[in-house]
């Protein structure tokens, strides 16, 4: 009786289990009674990432400078070419088939996680006690200065756009 | 048993953008080549893109590179295709399809499709 | 890229008739050759992989045969339910390409 499914690295065609190629391998021609799977490695060029039965390699991944990519990791005949961004850009996606400018947090939010090629930048609010003043894709939020060391008092309160304005005490006579 | 279930289709303006999505059920997703075929109205069947299990490696056919982008999120079993500067030609029924053991075509198991309208 | 060229574009036949379908490559595509069936408002369905393999749940009655450059998909006595439209689609080269399909209607 024919099999109706394959151990695993294997697979049915014409009634019978074959052999998957190996990784870095594409299939040039199925098994039989007689002869066992035909595969034949990749070229120079190319890839295979798993246990298969492609009848072609996958070229590797060309990253486009004019995209703002560069290789991070070379491709081998099991893997694919992985592109990154070039420095202030991130990718746009988990394949990284391009890159954008990372995004600068605004005044009243600090940055929480600074930007990789792979990542955005990550921005939160300013709490409390805590501002800032310029568009930044590097600044945190700065905690308002503290009137009281200096032996100042606060004449103006801050907000998570601006600092404390701090000012001499008032002299009682 | 396998499912795969699409969301996302509508009528878009030429150079809007929209994204499908395929939720996949019944078979290890990330072992999987999963793709993207569309059908104009009327019309046969055409090859859009195609992702690796990994999620690393990407193809597109050349109407639409630079401009479509297929992903996947293995731990949610979801495939996406994020589509941007969209044209009338891209108006299709558009179909994700998981290759069979081993292989990125044919394909096994198709979802139910969703429809694209581009037109102003 | 492979170009598949179907005929004839629409087969008009009866139930319980022989319908033949044939797939012309522009070149070699080996053995890796696909059958799907489709029907108005449907999904594609597998029927054949590699020239002559039936998917899982297809009945006997279709069949593949060819290599190369001239495949044919053969069913062998025409259902009601098989009226539909046929699509053949290579995958010995890249990007995998689908025929124009034929259409097989009732007469």
């Known amino acids: 009786e024919p099999p109706t499914a394959c151990r695993e690295k294997q697979y049915l065609i014409n009634s019978q289990c074959c052999s998957l190629c190996q990784p870095g391998q594409k299939l040039v021609s199925d098994c039989t009674e007689f002869t066992e799977t035909e595969c034949l490695p990749c070229s120079e060029s190319e890839f295979l990432d798993t246990w298969n039965r492609e009848t072609r390699c996958h070229q590797h991944k060309y990253c486009d400078p004019n995209l703002g990519l560069q290789v991070q990791q070379k491709g081998t005949s099991e893997t694919d070419t992985i592109c990154t961004c070039e420095e202030g850009l991130h990718c746009t996606s988990e394949s990284c088939e391009s890159c954008v400018p990372h995004r600068s947090c605004l005044p009243g939010f600090g940055v929480k996680q600074i930007a990789t090629g792979v990542s955005d930048t990550i921005c939160e609010p300013c709490p409390v006690g805590f501002f800032s003043n310029v568009s930044s894709a590097f600044e945190k939020c700065r905690p308002w200065t503290s009137c009281e060391t200096k032996d100042l008092v606060v004449q103006q309160a801050g907000t998570n756009k601006t600092d404390v304005v701090c000012g001499p005490q008032d002299r009682q006579r | 048993q396998v499912q795969l279930v699409q969301s996302g289709g509508g009528l878009v303006q030429p150079g809007g953008s929209l994204r499908l999505s395929c939720a996949a059920s019944g078979f290890t997703f990330s072992n999987y080549v999963m793709s993207w075929v569309r059908q104009a109205p009327g019309k046969g069947l055409e090859w859009v893109s195609t992702?690796?299990?990994?999620?690393?490696?990407?193809y597109y056919t050349d109407s639409v590179k630079g401009r479509f982008t297929t992903s996947r999120d293995n731990p949610k079993n979801t495939l996406f295709l994020q589509m941007s500067s969209l044209r009338a030609e891209d108006t299709a029924v558009y179909y994700c399809?998981?290759?069979?053991?081993?292989?990125?075509?044919?394909?096994?198991?198709w979802g139910q499709g969703t429809l694209v309208t581009v037109s102003s | 890229e492979i170009v598949l060229t179907q005929s004839p574009a629409t087969l008009s036949l009866s139930p319980g008739e022989r319908a033949t379908l044939s797939c012309r490559a522009s070149q070699s595509v080996r053995s890796f050759l696909a059958w799907y069936q489709q029907k108005p408002g449907q999904a594609p369905r597998l029927l054949i992989y590699?020239?002559?393999n039936r998917a899982t749940g297809i009945p006997a009655r279709f069949s593949g045969s060819g290599s190369g450059t001239d495949f044919t998909l053969t069913i062998s006595s025409l259902e009601p339910e098989d009226f539909a439209v046929y699509y053949c689609?290579?995958?010995?080269?890249?990007?995998?390409?689908f025929g124009q399909g034929t259409k097989v209607e009732i007469k």
């Open positions: 992702i690796r299990g990994s999620g690393i490696s990407t």
């Open positions: 590699e020239t002559s």
């Open positions: 399809a998981k290759g069979i053991v081993g292989a990125t075509t044919p394909f096994d198991y």
């Open positions: 689609q290579q995958r010995s080269d890249w990007p995998p390409t």
